[in-house]
């Protein structure tokens, strides 16, 4: 808490200026008026002040609006933002996708920090879902963002939103993030022709479930073994080797490669073994031939 | 006048982890941000990490993002470099650095420790 | 991050010469650029900073221009103490780039 002392005589501040920068700590408090401040913060960013001078700069900003800040004052925070602490975001109703640029664009490059998610979500749930325009800005800053999402917040991302998504934005989704955003992905590319349509979804198809698949496996799609891998298990299980062979066509030859690793290892336990012997890979551990498969689940949901 | 003296530097298997210590003193410790600046054999000036003066602002070169983490105590006036999963890449002279503010330039450093990564 | 780019690598001058060194960041960096002298087995010392602004205490010969993207260190009338190897530096972003450096030997 910097002292309440008078401003020595002539060292008022009219604007804020480069000036400012040899103005001791409780000078700057005495002398810089908090509204021209407010009203000028646009040049404190091309100013090198301290990170002690920012502190009272921020303190000054704090006693004028003790209920948050303005956004007119928000938008033009530069590295006076990195000083906010969540607690500060919290107060703040941040509207405008410029004014969340403009923040991000000071953190950018770098992880997200604690201020940023503050703001991100303080402004994600004044809109009250992932609009198209907002998740496109987060993702070009933040291409993780997504994936930071719990599957009950991607409940809210509008379908429409999906087309703002980039493969690279969904690399470190799990799962349960990616059975969320599935369906909304396949809502948003119905309209579009077979290669065009599996260009787009392929990404998401670690939520899609076996019936999609099996479609797939007749639209000659060539899936690459990377995104077979990333499948879920359950819906490659039902799968037959034929399907397989169709869904992945020239990159079936894969499959050698990741015989012990899931979904391949478990989908290869499945089948039978002269099954998989007609794709010629040599992949050993399927049914023995003369053995038969009780379905277990199926009897157990019958009865 | 300003000090900033590294020590904890040495010879580490790569794998290994180290810790990096900067004393300062002379200046008001908990008022600036501090820098870690390495420097390979025979090769140029490499910026690490920065730490902001209240220690919640941590800025990292991609090349060390995830294996190295900054922190600071300010009642003891140190400065630290913890270093995990070290690599051969990362032998080098560590420079410690202050700096006044986000517009301002490393205005005094220490006079480093050898970081020696090698099995 | 933005990249630093240092020309030339090596310069070969003598006593007395009037060396220039040139530094080019990949994006805008305002005036926000340092310049940093290095003697072999000591640490980097800042000799300008904000791109012209000269540390207090480095010899007058010491100039720098520049701003955005296109920025030059001049040494004037170079002295046998000068020979050493120079580094800018912008800290326009946290992630405070260096250039590759420039070594400056006797011709």
């Known amino acids: 808490e910097v002292e309440k002392t008078a401003c020595p005589s002539g060292k008022k501040a009219r604007e804020i200026d480069e000036s400012l920068i040899f103005y001791k700590k409780w000078e700057l408090e005495a002398c810089v008026d908090a509204a021209l401040l407010a009203t000028q913060m646009d040049r404190v960013n091309a100013i090198p002040f301290t990170y002690e001078q920012l502190d009272v700069l921020k303190h000054k900003l704090d006693e004028l609006y003790p209920q948050g800040y303005p956004e007119s004052v928000i938008q033009h925070l530069g590295y006076l933002f990195l000083k906010m602490s969540p607690e500060d975001i919290r107060k703040w109703n941040v509207t405008s996708l410029e004014t969340l640029k403009a923040l991000l664009e000071v953190n950018k490059g770098h992880e997200m920090s604690p201020q940023v998610a503050t703001l991100i979500d303080r402004f994600v749930k004044g809109r009250g879902q992932l609009d198209k325009d907002t998740l496109d800005t987060l993702t070009a800053f933040y291409p993780g963002y997504l994936c930071s999402l719990s599957p009950e917040e991607l409940s809210s991302v509008p379908p429409s939103s999906i087309w703002a998504v980039r493969p690279q934005d969904l690399d470190t989704c799990d799962p349960r993030q990616l059975d969320v955003l599935y369906p909304k992905a396949r809502l948003a590319f119905q309209n579009m022709n077979g290669s065009e349509y599996f260009v787009k979804i392929q990404s998401f198809l670690g939520g899609a479930p076996t019936e999609d698949l099996k479609a797939l496996s007749q639209q000659n799609v060539s899936m690459d073994l990377a995104t077979f891998m990333k499948l879920r298990t359950d819906a490659v299980l039902p799968l037959t080797v034929a399907e397989v062979q169709k869904l992945l066509g020239p990159h079936v030859e894969g499959l050698k490669a990741e015989e012990r690793h899931r979904p391949v290892r478990d989908w290869i336990l499945r089948q039978r073994q002269d099954d998989l012997d007609t794709l010629g890979l040599g992949l050993q551990g399927g049914i023995p031939n003369g053995y038969l498969v009780l379905d277990l689940s199926m009897q157990e949901a019958l009865s | 006048q300003v000090q900033l003296v590294e020590s904890g530097g040495g010879v580490v298997q790569p794998g290994r982890s180290l810790r990096l210590s900067c004393a300062a003193s002379?200046?008001?410790?908990?008022?600036?941000?501090m820098n870690w600046v390495r420097q390979a054999p025979g090769k140029g000036l490499e910026w690490v990490a920065v730490?902001?003066?209240?220690?919640?602002?941590?800025y990292y070169a991609d090349s060390v993002k995830g294996r190295f983490t900054i922190s600071r105590d300010n009642s003891k006036n140190t400065l630290y470099l913890q270093m995990n999963s070290l690599r051969a890449e990362d032998t080098a002279v560590y420079y410690c650095?202050?700096?006044?503010?986000?517009?301002?330039?490393?205005?005094?450093w220490g006079q480093g420790t050898l970081v020696t990564v090698s099995s | 991050d933005i990249q630093m780019t240092q020309s030339p690598s090596t310069l070969s001058a003598s006593v007395g010469d009037r060396v220039t060194i040139t530094c080019r960041a990949s994006?805008?960096?305002?005036?926000?650029l340092a310049w940093y002298q290095q003697k072999p087995g000591k640490a980097p010392k800042l000799l300008i900073y904000?791109?012209?602004s000269l540390e207090s205490g480095v010899p007058s010969r010491f100039s720098g221009s520049g701003s955005g993207t296109e920025f030059t260190l001049t040494i004037s009338n170079l002295q046998p103490d000068d020979f050493a190897t120079f580094y800018c530096?912008?800290?326009?972003?946290?992630?405070?780039?260096f250039g590759q450096g420039t070594k400056v030997e006797i011709k």
């Open positions: 650095a202050r700096d006044r503010g986000p517009l301002w330039p490393l205005d005094y």
């Open positions: 002379g200046f008001t410790f908990s008022s600036d941000a």
């Open positions: 730490i902001w003066n209240e220690g919640s602002n941590k």
């Open positions: 994006q805008s960096i305002s005036r926000w």
């Open positions: 904000k791109a012209s």
């Open positions: 530096q912008q800290y326009s972003s946290y992630s405070r780039t």
